[in-house]
């Protein structure tokens, strides 16, 4: 059974992940971002189901495409450090989902824009956090 300290650690990691995803979304939605239209043409795979930490496997598998899109989107008014940022996110995702069990991600039939993709995983984090608190 999870201890209160492990629950607290999980909550903090989820909050960390949530904040980083929100930062990316805020940057994309920034009124100065000149490449938003182009960014919205890239399609991301969405999880068929995302209700447990093991479902973060679906996010992990889309981190490389996310980094590539963020790299393409770099401009004077949209400056993130995609390699470092995605590396930070990947570390948290690996810790959260654990490596003990191998989970095969199932994706929904419909693909999504980067905004829909980020919103989906932000909602996931918020949902899991609410069950922990």
């Amino acid at each position: 059974a999870p201890t209160s300290s492990s629950t607290k650690k999980t909550q903090l990691q989820l909050e960390h992940l949530l904040l980083d995803l929100q930062m990316i979304l805020n940057g994309i939605n920034n009124y100065k971002n000149p490449k938003l239209t182009r960014m919205l043409t890239f399609k991301f795979y969405m999880p068929k189901k995302a209700t447990e930490l093991k479902h973060l496997q679906c996010l992990e598998e889309e981190l490389k495409p996310l980094e590539e899109v963020l790299n393409l989107a770099q401009s004077k008014n949209f400056h993130l450090r995609p390699r470092d940022l995605i590396s930070n996110i990947n570390v948290i995702v690996l810790e959260l989902k654990g490596s003990e069990t191998t989970f095969m991600c199932e994706y929904a039939d419909e693909t999504a824009t980067i905004v829909e993709f980020l919103n989906r995983w932000i909602t996931f984090c918020q949902s899991i956090i609410s069950t922990l608190t």
Partner: antibody, heavy 121, light 111 residues
Framework: QLQLQESGPGLVKPSQTLSLTCTVS??????????WSWIRQHPGKGLEWIGY???????YYNPSLKSRVTISVDTSKNQFSLKLSNVTAADTAVYYC?????????????WGRGTLVTVSS | NFMLTQPHSVSESPGKTVTISCTRS????????VQWYQQRPGSSPTTVIY?????PSGVPDRFSGSIDSSSNSASLTISGLKTEDEADYYC?????????FGGGTKLTVLG
């Protein structure tokens, strides 16, 4: 008005770890939209970026210092900290903390007053 | 990694105009914003120009910034020089992996 104040030992022995804390007042580290940075200035010389942290805990470091640097954040105390390991005399410098906007580009404002750290036995 | 090169020193008389250059060694100067900081002796740096040509509130309009892609350089221009402008000035920019400062320029206001 946002203010930043560095604190920590002014003297560190070679091969030890330099530890500094920046306390933020007049604003919250957790308000989002900003990274929290460390920059240093060697005596009589130019400025060098060390790295920064987002309040989520995500860190970004100068590649030349990455192997020795750890930046952490404590949102409950409205502080962020720098640890620089295995220091030598070349790490003697004034260390500044500063705020950096996310997304729109890396620049620094405001800056703390700075604290001089001397590495000597 | 790229470097930013500034003249070591410049000097000019009060009331005159002075320009400090900042040349990027590789990569386009226009690809990332350039900032300028003023540092008076014994003080921490303060921003006088950010995002190429923007002035923070409180910085007089005697300070202006510009970018010249043909010379791959940025410039800080100070008009109507005052004795209080005597200080070190640093340019700064960045790329996807690092933040870089110029070596600094000491501005002396003569007389």
């Amino acid at each position: 008005q946002l203010q930043l104040q560095e604190s920590g030992p002014g003297l560190v022995k070679p091969s030890q770890t330099l530890s500094l804390t920046c306390t933020v007042s007049g604003g919250s580290i957790s308000s989002g939209g900003y990274y929290w940075s460390w920059i240093r200035q060697h005596p009589g010389k130019g400025l060098e970026w060390i790295g920064y942290i987002y309040y989520s805990g995500s860190t970004y470091y100068n590649p030349s210092l990455k192997s020795r640097v750890t930046i952490s954040v404590d949102t409950s105390k409205n502080q962020f900290s720098l640890k620089l390991s295995n220091v030598t005399a070349a790490d003697t410098a004034v260390y500044y903390c500063a705020r950096t906007p996310t997304v729109t580009g890396d620049w620094f404002d405001p800056w703390g007053r700075g604290t001089l750290v001397t590495v000597s036995s | 990694n790229f470097m930013l090169t500034q003249p070591h020193s410049v000097s000019e008389s009060p009331g005159k105009t002075v320009t400090i250059s900042c040349t990027r060694s590789s990569g386009s100067i226009a690809s990332n914003y350039v900032q300028w900081y003023q540092q008076r002796p014994g003080s921490s740096p303060t921003t006088v120009i950010y995002e190429d040509n923007q002035r923070p509130s409180g910085v007089p309009d005697r300070f202006s910034g510009s970018i010249d892609s043909s010379s791959n350089s940025a410039s800080l221009t100070i008009s109507g020089l005052k004795t209080e402008d005597e200080a070190d000035y640093y340019c700064q920019s960045y790329d996807s992996s690092n933040v870089v400062f110029g070596g600094g320029t000491k501005l002396t206001v003569l007389g």
